[in-house]
Interface confidence: low
């Protein structure tokens, strides 16, 4: 690569978000970065609540568990954890609450053992489609990730770009089919209004999916059919009104599934009849006796399991000539 006449080490300190140049020399085995705590016995490095603005360059090669929480990282550039020699043992990386607003393509490249990644509580206005795949190839090398925790990564309304936040996250999950081995995906508290229909079909290894505390209104176009390993599906605290027959049949067909549906505004009218019948028979819904109606007003707080078909009526739709203004 070409570069300007001055070496990178002469970068001006007047730009605080500029990554400093780093030697390619491997760190000493017992070295611990400034502002961090290290335990070689536990293979753990903790750099917590230290207002770090970049990932320490001198991480010890033995690190297996790395906590970089409560910092001010702002940006994770490509190869943010690339080292010579590589951090070959790093398996769990927690970056939660570190004010990240941008994760660039290839940010987690050169981490061959990375199994668990937590980016929760960062306002990710710009999550590259290739953040996890590291490549824009249609099929990338498989990521080693097994758990991806992305709870509360939605940025404030005024920092969102003119594009779907759901779409941005899903693009990163699906790029290059790199996350085919993902077993746990947490996407709670992200204001999701919908779930793009293709996302679950392309994550066939999922065991645990957490979509709680979002704003999902419907699952009509979401297919669970391919998720034969799914063990838990968290849909609490959404805006679900009813689950329709197709969804009910798909959930019932999953051999190991437990579904959590508390605190949704169920609409108990004639469209709810199939769901009520299913709830009475199924064992897959945890705490099903706690599910209550939110609408219509006359049904509020009624327990779904206690309803019968006579309770579930729809007001007739009057022809225009009979409607009152």
């Amino acid at each position: 690569s070409s570069s300007p006449t001055s070496s990178a080490s002469s970068f001006s300190s007047s730009a605080p978000f500029l990554a400093s140049a780093v030697s390619a020399q491997p760190p000493l085995p017992d070295q611990c970065p400034a502002l961090c705590e290290c335990s070689e016995a536990a293979r753990t490095v903790k750099c917590v609540n230290r207002n770090l603005t970049e990932v320490p360059t001198d991480l010890p090669a033995y690190v297996r568990n790395l906590f970089l929480t409560g910092n001010q990282l702002a940006v994770l550039p490509a190869g943010a954890f690339a080292r010579r020699p590589p951090l070959a043992e790093l398996a769990a990386l927690n970056l939660s609450g570190s004010r990240l607003d941008e994760v660039r393509a290839g940010a987690f490249e050169h981490l061959p053992s990375l199994r668990q990644l937590d980016l929760s509580h960062n306002p990710l206005a710009d999550l590259s489609p290739f953040a996890f795949s590291g490549s824009n190839a249609s099929v990338s090398a498989p990521s080693p990730l097994v758990e991806l925790i992305l709870n509360h990564i939605v940025p404030p309304e005024d920092e969102r770009q003119n594009r779907s936040f759901e779409g941005m996250v899903v693009a990163a999950l699906l790029a290059g089919r790199a996350l085919q081995g993902l077993r746990r995906l947490e996407l709670a508290s992200n204001h999701f209004l919908y779930l793009p229909r293709d996302v679950l079909a392309q994550l066939p290894s999922l065991r645990h999916l957490d979509l709680s505390n979002n704003s999902l209104v419907s699952l009509t176009y979401v297919s669970f059919r391919n998720l034969t390993h799914l063990e838990s599906l968290h849909l609490e605290d959404n805006a679900l009104k009813v689950l329709h027959n197709g969804t009910l049949a798909e959930l019932q067909g999953l051999p190991h599934i437990r579904v959590f549906l508390d605190n949704n505004p169920w609409v108990c009218d004639c469209h709810m009849a199939d769901m009520v019948t299913w709830l009475k028979e199924t064992e897959v819904v945890q705490g099903k006796d706690r599910l209550t109606c939110a609408y219509p007003e006359k049904m509020r707080n009624r327990v779904l399991l206690e309803l019968n078909s006579a309770d579930l009526d729809c007001d007739p739709i009057l022809p225009p000539s009979l409607q009152t203004s």
């Epitope: 070409s2 570069s3 780093v22 190869g79 690339a82 206005a125 290739f130 003119n162």
Partner: nanobody, 120 residues
């Protein structure tokens, strides 16, 4: 082969404006954050401004805030720097930068630079 070609530099009077462009090729432009740096005579390299992949987030050095605006057109594979209210201290060679990987592994790429001279 990655190529970055800057244009738009020149001589301008204090208080004037210029618009720099950087045409990129050889990589998926829309997938990478881009930056403008500058190097004044006898000085070190200074980061002027950077922009995220979709252009939704920008950052500026304090010395140019409110005067310079970085933008990008992913359809045209082009990065821009609009420079207003130029001052003598803005005189420098301006470089376009694409950080495609960690700088320490030599995976950042630079244009050849374009000279901006602010003088009356």
């Amino acid at each position: 082969e990655v190529q970055l070609v800057e244009s738009g530099g020149g001589l301008v009077q204090p208080g004037g404006s210029l618009r720099l462009s950087c045409a990129a090729s050889g990589f998926t432009f829309s997938s990478y954050a881009m930056s403008w740096y500058r190097q004044a005579p006898g000085k070190g390299l200074e980061l002027v401004a950077s922009i995220t992949t979709a252009g939704g987030s920008t950052r500026y050095a304090d010395s140019v805030k409110g005067r310079f605006t970085i933008s990008r057109d992913n359809a045209k594979n082009t990065l821009y720097l609009q420079m207003n209210s130029l001052r003598a201290e803005d005189t420098a060679v301006y470089y376009c930068n694409a950080e495609l990987g960690p700088r320490r592994l030599g995976m950042d790429y630079w244009g050849q630079g374009t000279l901006v001279t602010v003088s009356s």
